[in-house]
Amino acid sequence: CDLPQTHSLGNRRALILLAQMGRISPFSCLKDRHDFGFPQEEFDGNQFQKAQAISVLHEMIQQTFNLFSTKDSSATWEQSLLEKFSTELNQQLNDMEACVIQEVGVEETPLMNVDSILAVKKYFQRITLYLTEKKYSPCAWEVVRAEIMRSFSLSKIFQERLRRKE
């Protein structure tokens, strides 16, 4: 399964769309910066088998998809860009699911790394809580957009390492 290569391209397209989605000047939002505690350690280890690694990436994309599929998100971002972004994420999710199924027969290890997936879930819970506390303000969404762009960039490094392992 050649997921890392195709996923890396999809990741790049998603990042470009995220970059284009900005609606207000981020310079007005400096005081809204927040530490979401990106679970870096879950993307650092070489302990994962390929299927486990893909399942963690899948969870991150799924949570991002969920976050940007809310009505609050629709009210914030330009609809055409949001739709393209969601379509891109959806395609990545489908590719990953197909890839995981392929890998199951190859590996003896469990399909999912439960602790890592839980860490990603909690990370997105913190993001959602922040948006709620900030009443989904334009600046709060700008901070979240910047955070998601950063997490995508960090996961991209993880994917490239995964590809080198093959």
Epitope: P26, F27, K31, H34
Partner: antibody, heavy 121, light 107 residues
Framework: EVQLVQSGAEVKKPGESLKISCKGS????????IGWVRQMPGKGLEWMGI????????AYSPSFQGQVTISADKSISTAYLQWSSLKASDTAMYYC??????????????WGQGTLVTVSS | DIQMTQSPSSLSASVGDRVTITCRAS??????LNWYQQKPGKAPKLLIY???SLQSGVPSRFSGSGSGTDFTLTISSLQPEDFATYYC?????????FGQGTKVEIK
């Protein structure tokens, strides 16, 4: 290795124009903002302004608004600081530094080596 | 604009001394404060960010504390290479502003 490399020292006359540069390498240039800081001889640090190289959005300190222009060319990972008409009081060391934008990460963690601008008749 | 006031403006100390520099903001900046060290002829170097986080590669003898309007940089045991000028900088809002600096000299 992350690096910000600035253009060399400049000696200019009052009224002349000038554009100094700051080239970033070893990181994604558009993922960080670039700030400019002035240090006049024997004095402290003064923040001048900042640019987001991804879209060239800028913000200036009121003290420098209209006095300088900050720009960037993301295709060559370079930010610029320019003057259209220099004054003797612009004599200073100018530093560029990278900023993580809205991310929770260290501010101004990497700095250029500085560009000394001397304005004298 | 948010004004940043450092004290003292200069101090003399010996190697091994515990040194404390304070920085006060004209309004609350939560924990959005950075500390830099600058040596003559060199670019500033980030020591502490977000009031208390030690920048990678900076010795653990440097520490930062505070929130709101009052902040402190502490050097637990001054080393010969620590003689320099130290600046605080608020990272809360634009325009970003620096303190006037504290020069740490050899006694």
């Amino acid at each position: 290795e992350v690096q910000l490399v600035q253009s060399g020292a400049e000696v200019k006359k009052p009224g002349e124009s000038l554009k100094i540069s700051c080239k970033g390498s070893g990181y994604s240039f558009t993922s960080y903002w670039i700030g400019w800081v002035r240090q006049m001889p024997g004095k402290g640090l003064e923040w001048m302004g900042i640019i987001d190289p991804s879209d060239s959005d800028t913000a200036y300190s009121p003290s420098f608004q209209g006095q300088v222009t900050i720009s960037a060319d993301k295709s060559i990972s370079t930010a610029y600081l320019q003057w259209s008409s220099l004054k003797a009081s612009d004599t200073a060391m100018y530093y560029c530094a990278r900023h993580p934008g809205l991310n929770w990460a260290p501010d101004f963690d990497y700095w250029g080596q500085g560009t000394l601008v001397t304005v004298s008749s | 604009d948010i004004q940043m006031t450092q004290s003292p403006s200069s101090l003399s100390a010996s190697v091994g001394d515990r040194v404390t520099i304070t920085c006060r903001a004209s309004q609350s900046i939560d924990g959005a404060l950075n500390w830099y060290q600058q040596k003559p002829g060199k670019a500033p170097k980030l020591l502490i960010y977000f009031a208390s986080s030690l920048q990678s590669g900076v010795p653990s003898r440097f520490s930062g504390s505070g929130s709101g309007t009052d902040f402190t940089l502490t050097i637990s045991s001054l080393q010969p290479e620590d003689f320099a000028t130290y600046y605080c900088q608020q990272a809360y809002d634009f325009p970003l502003t620096f303190g006037q600096g504290t020069k740490v000299e050899i006694k």
